[in-house]
Interface confidence: low
Amino acid sequence: KKVVLGKKGDTVELTCTASQKKSIQFHWKNSNQIKILGNQGSFLTKGPSKLNDRADSRRSLWDQGNFPLIIKNLKIEDSDTYICEVEDQKEEVQLLVFGLTANSDTHLLQGQSLTLTLESPPGSSPSVQCRSPRGKNIQGGKTLSVSQLELQDSGTWTCTVLQNQKKVEFKIDIVVLAFQKASSIVYKKEGEQVEFSFPLAFTVEKLTGSGELWWQAERASSSKSWITFDLKNKEVSVKRVTQDPKLQMGKKLPLHLTLPQALPQYAGSGNLTLALEAKTGKLHQEVNLVVMRATQLQKNLTCEVWGPTSPKLMLSLKLENKEAKVSKREKAVWVLNPEAGMWQCLLSDSGQVLLESNIKVLPTWSTPVQP
C-alpha cells in the first residue's frame, strides 16, 4: 500500500493509472466504500461523500489512462485509505494528513511562549523537528514549546514531520511583537526640546490598543504617569496628559513623544507600555533622559548632569582648544576662578562625546553669557 503525507489546508493528488492509455470507467472510493468521484463518459461525477465539494480530478489526463484524485483544503479527518477501481483492479493509497499550528496566535509578545501543536491522524506516530529563524533546533512529539521568545525568533519556522520514512514540511510565520529597542537613552542640554521615539519591530495591517508612559524623575520620590493614549488602526489619540511637563504626541506610528524642554527635574527613566487588543501582556520600552546644565555663579563655573548615567562616563570642563581643566567620573565638576573664554562641558564615554554644553566666561567685571 502506497503512503502519501498531506498538509492540513493544502491540496494532495493521489495517482491512479490504468494499463490502457485511454479514458475508461473509473472511480475512487474511501475505506467505507463510499464513492468520492468517478466518470461517466467524459464527465466527472461526484458521489455523496464528505469530500463532495473538495474532490476533483484532472480530466485532461484521462485520455492518457491517468485518473488522479485531487483533494483540496485537506482536513485531518481526510486521513484514510483511498481505493481507485479501474479495469477490474484496485489501487490503494493511504493518505495521512498532518496539521501544525501555533498556540492561539502567530503574533506573540516578546517574552511569551510559543507552543506548536501537531495534529495527526489516529494510529500515526510522527516525530517533529523545528528550526527557528535564528537556527535553533527543537524536537518533540505532539507539542513543541519555546519559552521566552526573543525578537530574533520573528520569522519563518520550518518544521519537518516524519512518518513511515516519509516527511512533510511546514512553514509557520511567527511575529514577535516588541519594540525595536528594549531601552534607549537621550542626552540633552537644559532647555532643548526632547524627542522620544518608540519604533515597533513588526508591522501589522491593523494595530489597536492603549499605552502609557510612566516617568520616574531622579529628583522625585515616586513615579508618575506622564501621558496615556489610545491606538486605533495605527492612529494615535491622546487620552490624558500631565500639565507639567506637557508632552505632545504624534498622531501616526512610530509612537513619537515630544518634551517641550529638557530640565533637571525631568531627568530620569520612563517606561512606555503598550497593551494590544486581544493580547495578554504588554510591550515595554525603557527610555532614559540625561540633562546637562553649565552655570557660572560668582567665581565658580559648574557643570552638572542629571539622570541615569553609567559610572564609566566622564564629565569634563575645558577651555576651548585647551586640555581639560577637570575630568571626573562624577555627575558634577567645577572650576574656581575660571579664565575668560568659551568653556566646554563634555559628557563622554571612552572618548566619544555624548553631550556638550558651552558657556562663555567674561572677564570678572561683567556677567556671564550663556549661548
Epitope: H27, K35, G38, G41, F43, L44, G47, N52, K72
Partner: antibody, heavy 115, light 108 residues
Framework: LQQSGPELVKPGASVKMSCKAS????????INWLNQRTGQGLEWIGE????????YYNEMFKGKATLTADKSSNTAYMQLSSLTSEDSAVYFC???????????WGRGTLVTVSA | LTQSPASLAVSLGQRATISCKAS??????????MNWYQQKPGQPPKLLIY???NLESGIPARFSGSGSGTDFTLNIHPVEEEDAATYYC?????????FGGGTKLEIK
C-alpha cells in the same frame, strides 16, 4: 450568497457580476453559476473551485462566460462577453450542501441587454 | 429531463404528483443523482429533495421523492396553499447538470 445588483448593458458589451460568500469556508465549496430567462427553465453555466481557481463550463457557455474567484474577499465572479438580447436573463450563483443538489442560492442578478 | 405535467391544479389537502423522466440513467454506484426544487416568482429555486429521496434540512415532510434509473417522482401530500409554485427536477450525475422544463402547481 450575496449577488451584485441588476445590469443594463448594450449589445456587444461585457458585464461582470459578483457573488459574495459568507457563513462558511469559501474554499470548501464549489460555486456554480446558472441562468434563467424570463418564464423559462434553468441552465447550468459552469462551476469554479475557489481554492484552486479551476473552472469548468457547460459547452454552451464556453467563450461566453468566464468564472473567477477571489479568496481574499470570499467572492466569485462571472464575466459575460459579446452580449446579445439572448443573454438577457437572471443569473444565479449557488453551492451544494451535504447532498448532491444546490442547497444555497444567491437572489440572482438580472442582466438586460438592450440598445 | 422531461417533466410532466407542465401544469396541474390540486385541491387543498390533496396529493400532487410530478414526474421526471431522464433520457439515460442518472444512477451511479448505487445512488440516484436526481434533485427536486421549488421556485416562486422573483425568488431563487429552493432545494427540496436530493439524491432522489433525501429530504433537505428544513423542508416539511409532506414533500417526498422516489424513483431510480430514469423515472422519478415528487409527491406533495397534503398540499398546502404555500405550495403554489413551479417545481423542477435536476440531474447531477454528470456534467453539465440539467433541469427539467418545470411543472406549475396551482392550488384549488
Amino acid at each position: 450568497l450575496q449577488q451584485s445588483g441588476p445590469e443594463l448593458v448594450k449589445p456587444g458589451a461585457s458585464v461582470k457580476m459578483s457573488c459574495k460568500a459568507s457563513g462558511y469556508t469559501f474554499t470548501d465549496y464549489v460555486i456554480n453559476w446558472l441562468n434563467q430567462r424570463t418564464g423559462q427553465g434553468l441552465e447550468w453555466i459552469g462551476e469554479i473551485y475557489p481554492g484552486s481557481g479551476s473552472a469548468y463550463y457547460n459547452e454552451m457557455f464556453k467563450g461566453k462566460a468566464t468564472l473567477t474567484a477571489d479568496k481574499s474577499s470570499n467572492t466569485a465572479y462571472m464575466q459575460l462577453s459579446s452580449l446579445t438580447s439572448e443573454d438577457s436573463a437572471v443569473y444565479f450563483c449557488a453551492r451544494r450542501g451535504t447532498g448532491t443538489g444546490f442547497a444555497y442560492w444567491g437572489r440572482g442578478t438580472l442582466v438586460t441587454v438592450s440598445a | 429531463l422531461t417533466q410532466s405535467p407542465a401544469s396541474l391544479a390540486v385541491s387543498l389537502g390533496q396529493r400532487a404528483t410530478i414526474s421526471c423522466k431522464a433520457s439515460q440513467s442518472v444512477d451511479y454506484d448505487g445512488d440516484s443523482y436526481m434533485n427536486w426544487y421549488q421556485q416562486k416568482p422573483g425568488q431563487p429555486p429552493k432545494l427540496l429533495i436530493y439524491a432522489a429521496s433525501n429530504l433537505e434540512s428544513g423542508i416539511p415532510a409532506r414533500f417526498s421523492g422516489s424513483g431510480s434509473g430514469t423515472d422519478f417522482t415528487l409527491n406533495i401530500h397534503p398540499v398546502e396553499e404555500e405550495d403554489a409554485a413551479t417545481y423542477y427536477c435536476q440531474q447531477s450525475s454528470e456534467d453539465p447538470p440539467t433541469f427539467g422544463g418545470g411543472t406549475k402547481l396551482e392550488i384549488k
